[in-house]
Interface confidence: medium
């Protein structure tokens, strides 16, 4: 298994955007790396988003994904947007070195993302 | 020492208000209880506010205090207002049974209060 580090706590901005770094210890030079963000809340785990990084290309999530990210050697800078207070939870970074073999899997301990819904702005008269 | 319980984490509202309960295990029926909120950040501890509860009266903080609270048996409901992102930190509840003797002191493990500054509302035209 592969060691994956991520921050313990992150606060989403009042616009519902949270960013954190997911860093992994790689035993070799992978040309294909898959990054998945999982959310754990009430012992339920759901997939938030996933992307595959091919060496030389960008880290690309699906068009309708709430995640964006950049890749720099063994560091993945992740940004999750559109978060609401109800999305507060533990966000786990899962990294897979897909190719070439040997395949390695690493799962972080999770980043607790706290989200506070903003107060609505007063109507302009 | 007296056991004091308080939540591990609390999120301030987008208005900068954070509320939490500080509960203590009292070995007797005290008629005078002093409650102090301390803030720990970067290994520095500062006093945020303090109030003394006299049985039959209300829990009264100073007029210019950022704290308010109510007392119910051995539970203190504390509210801290006017918080900004820079006020994020560990807020420790300290309870002293002042009268009658014997004097008891209890200090909680602290509540991590996270504060996010709101985005400014757009100017009305």
């Amino acid at each position: 298994a592969m060691h994956v580090a991520q921050p313990a706590v992150v606060l989403a901005s009042s616009r519902g955007i949270a960013s954190f770094v997911c860093e992994y210890a790689s035993p070799g030079k992978a040309t294909e790396v898959r990054v998945t963000v999982l959310r754990q809340a009430d012992s339920q785990v759901t997939e938030v988003c996933a992307a595959t990084y091919m060496m030389g290309n960008e880290l690309t999530f699906l068009d309708d994904s709430i995640c964006t990210g950049t890749f720099n050697e063994s560091r993945v800078n992740l940004t999750i947007q559109g978060l609401r207070a109800m999305d507060t939870g533990l966000y786990i970074c899962k990294v897979e070195l897909m190719y070439p073999p040997p395949y390695y899997l690493g799962i972080g301990n999770g980043t607790q993302i706290y989200v506070i819904d903003p107060e609505p702005c007063p109507d302009s008269d | 020492a007296m056991h004091v319980a308080q939540p591990a984490v609390v999120l301030a509202s987008s208005r900068g208000i954070a509320s939490f309960v500080c509960e203590y295990a009292s070995p007797g029926k005290a008629t005078e209880v002093r409650v102090t909120v301390l803030r720990q950040a970067d290994s520095q501890v500062t006093e945020v506010c303090a109030a003394t509860y006299m049985m039959g009266n209300e829990l009264t903080f100073l007029d210019d205090s950022i704290c308010t609270g109510t007392f119910n048996e051995s539970r203190v409901n504390l509210t801290i207002q006017g918080l900004r992102a820079m006020d994020t930190g560990l807020y420790i509840c300290k309870v002293e049974l002042m009268y009658p003797p014997p004097y008891y002191l209890g200090i909680g493990n602290g509540t991590q209060i996270y504060v996010i500054d709101p985005e400014p509302c757009p100017d009305s035209d």
Epitope: A1, M2, H3, A25, P27, G28, M98, P100, P101, P102, Y103, Y104, L105, G106 | -
Partner: antibody, heavy 125, light 107 residues
Framework: QVQLKESGPGLVAPSQSLSITCTVS????????LSWVRQPPGKGLEWLGV???????NFHSALISRLTISKDNSKSQVFLELNSLQTDDTATYYC???????????????????WGQGTSVTVSS | DIQMTQSPASLSVSVGETVTITCRAS??????LAWYQQKQGKSPQLLVY???NLADGVPSRFSGSGSGTQYSLKINSLQSEDFGTYFC?????????FGGGTKLEIK
């Protein structure tokens, strides 16, 4: 049940090539890696190399110029070829199923979980 | 390449005793470590994978522990069938090098 069996020449002259075949049953070479390990008489184990489910190979750095590992999935056979033999290549040669993460599995650690009985090779004129 | 240093090289013990064999990696191998047992004239057999997990059919008197660069194999209440040679192997990126081995002999 998982079985592996090595077959080799027994005696090889110095400077010649060694060819050993490992025939497996009970698992598919398209799903698992297969490692080669040797053990000189009275000495410890030396990992030589591995061929993965997709035909990718990794070798011990000291043998990279002399060692070839290939396979025939349809015959469930893996082949080791070691060139330019010297007397210190005299050893028992083992093949071993290399359990662990392959694409799409759910398990994060590697091990050589099943071994053949070994084939003894003597390099001598 | 990652080097594996195993100690002691040999050990003479009696049936019923407890022994501990240690293995040190030259760098962090993140618990990607296996232990094998080899009896005279036989092929090695997997005992422990992922530093702490017992392989199928391995008696519970065997236990693995450790993390980072330091790992150990403990055998409680040694049985006569436990005598032989034990090897550790790292599996954190190739080459998957072995330790030098520990020969366990009956006193």
């Amino acid at each position: 049940q998982v079985q592996l069996k090595e077959s080799g020449p027994g005696l090889v002259a110095p400077s010649q090539s060694l060819s050993i075949t490992c025939t497996v049953s009970g698992f598919s070479l398209t799903s698992y890696g297969l490692s080669w390990v040797r053990q000189p008489p009275g000495k410890g184990l030396e990992w030589l190399g591995v061929i993965w489910y997709d035909g990718n190979t990794n070798f011990h750095s000291a043998l990279i110029s002399r060692l070839t590992i290939s396979k025939d999935n349809s015959k469930s056979q893996v082949f080791l070829e070691l060139n330019s033999l010297q007397t210190d290549d005299t050893a028992t040669y083992y093949c071993a199923k290399t359990e662990g993460h392959y694409y799409g599995s759910n398990y994060g650690y590697y091990a050589l979980d099943y071994w053949g009985q070994g084939t003894s090779v003597t390099v001598s004129s | 390449d990652i080097q594996m240093t195993q100690s002691p090289a040999s050990l003479s013990v009696s049936v019923g005793e407890t022994v501990t064999i240690t293995c040190r990696a030259s760098e962090n191998i993140y618990s990607n470590l296996a232990w094998y047992q080899q009896k005279q004239g036989k092929s090695p057999q997997l005992l422990v994978y992922a530093a702490t997990n017992l392989a199928d059919g391995v008696p519970s008197r065997f236990s693995g522990s450790g993390s980072g660069t330091q790992y150990s194999l403990k055998i409680n209440s040694l049985q006569s069938e436990d005598f032989g040679t034990y090897f550790c192997q790292h599996l954190w990126g190739t080459p998957y090098t072995f330790g030098g081995g520990t020969k366990l002999e009956i006193k």
